[in-house]
């Protein structure tokens, strides 16, 4: 609808009208998967009662989810930017593979377990213009992967919601430990 | 199924402000992203800038940041677009698109788009 | 920006044959494997409407006639065959960079 000259709207405007930044741009993509992944774990905790289950660790073996260790240079003792941002960029480019599997584990949440696979791609994206090292990164082999996401497909239903819990869990895990050494960049 | 619902047009007078809305269903309005694009026979298409819902951030064209202001209201689903001190260059049809990559995004769905005309 | 200029403008192509419209990138749109180049079809009085994302990956419910090629900075997408609703624009986006840019368009008549 029109607005009369020098009339405000009532809505009150984002603050930021700046394009954003890199590191805004990185910190909202995150935040934007963190909340994706949250839908789809309350998908699968309402469906499973893998959320509760202690039998995890049946599962954790086939598995080989990356994790943030204190070697990788993203904790605050032992920060080294450059050493964490080649992990953050190496971690998720093993995530992909997972959340590849997520893809048809979803009934209800089908299209947000795609947005949170395309958003991830996004951000890695965003990351590769961050970092300095890129010959550091190791990409995945894609036969190792396609043999990988045969074997998770392969599983009995238990293990393959087990699975869908795990990566979910490992996944938010990561992208928090992420944000956090992201933002003392 | 996903839609977005887009008044189809505006008559708006030179130096006025219009706001524009886009009312969504078929989906879970506030885990998604709109984005706003202007098309032109002149100039094409053209990304504005994005809004999240979930909590109000937004993300905006250098060539548009002075321009437009992008709002969402989470109770009846709906994202807005303010265009302020408006011009003849400002006639185009505007789009909404939900992005599902995030704030940087390629759009399966889309509005009909808004077609402003700014005149006297 | 990134600029990115479609070839040609505007072609005709007769039914059952096929179409192949080009789109080049003033700079590279990969990153690890994945080109962020999309690919649009609009007809007059509607939005565009989403054919192909990364490049090559085709969209849900869009016939296999439209494919997408390319890596980096030169990218194709082609009809084979060409059907008469296939009479349209076709434009080309890339999101590898803020501000998202599009193609200029290449409008396929039939002849």
């Known amino acids: 609808a029109p607005v009369p000259p020098g009339e405000d709207s009532k809505d009150v405007a984002a603050p930021h009208r700046q394009p954003l930044t890199s590191s805004e741009r990185i910190d909202k993509q995150i935040r934007y998967i963190l909340d994706g992944i949250s839908a789809l774990r309350k998908e699968t905790c309402n469906k499973s009662n893998m959320c509760e289950s202690s039998k995890e660790a049946l599962a954790e073996n086939n598995l080989n989810l990356p994790k943030m260790a204190e070697k990788d240079g993203c904790f605050q003792s032992g920060f080294n930017e450059e050493t964490c941002l080649v992990k953050i960029i190496t971690g998720l480019l093993e995530f992909e593979v997972y959340l590849e599997y997520l893809q048809n584990r979803f009934e209800s949440s089908e299209e947000q377990a795609r947005a949170v696979q395309m958003s991830t791609k996004v951000l890695i994206q965003f990351l590769q213009k961050k970092a300095k090292n890129l010959d550091a990164i190791t990409t995945p082999d894609p036969t190792t992967n396609a043999s990988l996401l045969t074997k998770l497909q392969a599983q009995n239903q238990w293990l393959q919601d087990m699975t869908t819990h795990l990566i979910l869990r490992s996944f938010k895990e990561f992208l928090q430990s992420s944000l956090r050494a992201l933002r003392q960049m | 199924q996903v839609q977005l619902q887009q008044p189809g047009a505006e008559l708006v007078k030179p130096g006025a402000s219009v706001k524009m809305s886009c009312k969504a269903s078929?989906?879970?309005?506030?885990?998604?992203?709109i984005h706003w694009i202007k098309q032109t026979p002149g100039q094409g298409l053209e990304w504005i800038g994005a809004?999240?819902?979930?909590?109000?951030?937004?993300s905006y064209s250098q060539k548009f940041k002075d321009k437009a202001t992008l709002t969402a209201d989470r109770s009846s689903s709906t994202a807005y677009m303010q265009l302020s001190s408006l011009t003849s260059e400002d006639s185009a049809v505007y789009y909404c698109?939900?992005?599902?990559?995030?704030?940087?995004?390629?759009?399966?769905?889309w509005g009909q788009g808004t077609l402003v005309t700014v005149s006297a | 920006n990134i600029v990115l200029t479609q070839s040609p403008a505007s072609l005709a192509v007769s039914l059952g044959q096929r179409a192949t419209i080009s789109c080049s990138a003033s700079?590279?749109?990969?990153?690890?494997?994945?080109?962020?180049m999309h690919w649009y079809q609009q007809r007059p009085g509607q939005p565009p409407k989403l054919l192909i994302y990364?490049?090559?990956k085709l969209e849900s419910g869009v016939p296999a006639r439209f494919s997408g090629s390319g890596s980096r900075t030169e990218f194709t997408l082609t009809i084979d065959p060409v059907e008469a609703e296939d009479a349209a624009t076709y434009y080309c986006q890339q999101n590898n960079e803020d501000p998202l840019t599009f193609g200029a368009g290449t409008k396929l008549e039939l002849k």
């Open positions: 078929g989906y879970t309005f506030t885990n998604y992203i």
């Open positions: 990364l490049a090559s």
């Open positions: 809004i999240y819902p979930g909590n109000g951030d937004t």
């Open positions: 700079e590279s749109v990969d990153s690890y494997g994945n080109n962020f």
């Open positions: 698109a939900r992005g599902d990559a995030g704030y940087s995004a390629w759009f399966a769905y």
